[in-house]
């Protein structure tokens, strides 16, 4: 019993002595935040110079305050103990840790690409000024039917399934959370529509083939014989929709 008491006292003395010797060995540990330690002077703790800070204390130098310039604006002024905090000017929003970048806002129904704000492709929507276009909810996956069609700005609204449309049932189900783009039924529907259009074109072409004069026929054949090429993008592309490719990344102004 007496031995354990002795051990506790000894440990306490050791800890207190360590604290004291730590102060003597490393006087910099006595400097608070807002100061830096200069061992070459008698008063080793000096206040941080203007436009600099130290948030921890015991530091050999003070850090230069962040300056919120250009597209950045000051949310919190720099003090001797804490760095300035920035946010973005109107029309831009913060990206990255501590708002390290400002990204341009787009309108609802658009997303930001390398070439600026682009309208959401058919079958996708964005209800915010930031972020990417997401596919509409597929109501049929939940056995529902589309009650309100989707737009570039709004997701579809799912209603009861056709089987549920009895006089008593009239509940409207909010759309399920947006799914990750993949081989969703919207894309399948899109390709079906595309195939139908192609067939119609083929039908139209065959009709033409037997009804036009030779010169006209040659001209039409020339058009269809051209190899398929991606259309060259024009500089003014505000109304072009943005179908994102995996390598596309968010644009941003770095600090």
């Amino acid at each position: 019993m007496g031995n354990s008491c002795y051990n506790i006292v000894a440990t306490l003395l050791l800890v207190l002595n360590f604290e004291r010797t730590r102060s003597l060995q490393d006087p910099c540990s006595n400097c608070p935040a807002g100061t830096f330690c200069d061992n070459n002077r008698n008063q080793i703790c000096s206040p941080c110079p203007p436009n600099s800070f130290s948030s921890a204390g015991g530091q050999r130098t003070c850090d230069i305050c962040r300056q919120c310039k250009g597209v950045f604006r000051t949310r919190k002024e720099c003090s001797s103990t804490s760095n300035a905090e920035c946010d973005c000017t109107p029309g831009f929003h913060c990206l990255g840790a501590g708002c390290s970048m400002c990204e341009q806002d787009c309108k609802q129904g658009q997303e930001l690409t390398k070439k600026g704000c682009k309208d959401c492709c058919f079958g996708t929507f964005n209800d915010q000024k930031r972020g990417i276009c997401r596919p509409w909810t597929n109501c049929s996956l939940d056995g529902k039917s589309v009650l309100v069609n989707g737009t570039k700005e709004r997701d579809v609204v799912c209603g009861p399934s056709p089987a549920d449309l009895s006089p008593g049932a009239s509940s409207v189900t909010p759309p399920a959370p947006a799914r990750e783009p993949g081989h969703s039924p919207q894309i399948i529907s899109f390709f079906l529509a595309l195939t139908s259009t192609a067939l119609l074109f083929l039908l139209f072409f065959l009709t033409l083939r037997f009804s036009v004069v030779k010169r006209g026929r040659k001209k039409l054949l020339y058009i269809f014989k051209q190899p398929f090429m991606r259309p060259v993008q024009t500089t003014q592309e505000e109304d072009g929709c943005s179908c994102r490719f995996p390598e596309e990344e968010e644009g941003g102004c770095e600090l």
């Epitope: 608070p32 080793i44 001797s80």
Partner: antibody, heavy 120, light 113 residues
Framework: QVQLQQSGPQLIRPGASVKISCKAS????????IHWVKQRPGQGLEWIGM????????RLNQKFKDKATLTVDKSSTTAYMQLSSPTSEDSAVFYC?????????????WGQGTLVTVSA | DIVMTQSPSSLTVTAGEKVTMSCKSS????????????LAWYQQKPGQPPKLLIY???TRESGVPDRFTGSGSGTDFTLTISSVQTEDLAVYHC?????????FGAGTKLELK
């Protein structure tokens, strides 16, 4: 031992600037910041600002930025504080002070104080 | 600026009595890096400059009698005089020693009954 010797009491007219001194001895003058503190009769203490004698870098309390000017003369190891356009509000005892050791460890060394009376 | 609030503004005591006075800061004076609280206590007698009693909230200045004890952390601090002597009658000031501008409390006046 560390000593801070201040100039004597001053009676001045409103608007006439006043300069008070603080002579340091017994330690390395350029090694420690000199602080100035104001105390109005029967009131608390107010920190005016501080000066680094090694390079004359000053830090002033915003409240006193248009009122006090801090200077030093290294050759005579003396710190000065000048008060501009004094009013009755500036009637007070002004102290110079120095930190104990490391800095930010309390003012262990004080001058005896200089009484400034502003009166018409 | 950090505002220092002392209470009570005055205390009437008898010799030998234990006394405690409070000092509260509007912001924490605790430096997390070294676990030190940057608060100082001073004693001031009429016609004299303040005298440092306690620094870093609880470290007694050399030559200060051990009846004076500083305690507390963060924003709440206390100065205790275990057994008041007649020579202890004075005004006691607490001071933020953590960030500029350095600020003082209005003081607690210790008077004899």
């Amino acid at each position: 031992q560390v000593q801070l010797q201040q100039s004597g009491p001053q009676l001045i007219r409103p608007g006439a600037s006043v300069k008070i001194s603080c002579k340091a001895s017994g330690y390395s003058f350029t090694g420690y910041w000199i602080h100035w503190v104001k105390q109005r009769p029967g009131q608390g203490l107010e920190w005016i600002g501080m000066i680094d004698p090694s390079d004359s870098e000053t830090r002033l309390n915003q409240k006193f930025k248009d009122k006090a000017t801090l200077t030093v003369d290294k050759s005579s190891t003396t710190a000065y504080m000048q008060l501009s356009s004094p009013t009755s509000e500036d009637s007070a005892v002004f102290y110079c002070a120095r930190y104990r050791n490391y800095g930010y460890d309390g003012f262990a060394h004080w001058g005896q104080g200089t009484l400034v009376t502003v009166s018409a | 600026d950090i505002v220092m609030t002392q209470s009570p503004s005055s205390l009437t005591v008898t010799a030998g009595e234990k006394v405690t006075m409070s000092c509260k800061s509007s912001q924490s004076l605790l430096n997390s890096g070294n676990e030190k609280n940057y608060l100082a206590w001073y004693q001031q007698k009429p016609g004299q400059p303040p005298k440092l009693l306690i620094y870093w909230a609880s470290t007694r200045e050399s030559g200060v009698p051990d009846r004076f004890t500083g305690s507390g952390s963060g924003t709440d601090f206390t100065l205790t005089i275990s057994s008041v002597q007649t020579e202890d009658l004075a005004v006691y000031h607490c001071q933020n020693d953590y960030s500029l501008p350095l600020t003082f409390g209005a003081g607690t006046k210790l008077e004899l009954k």
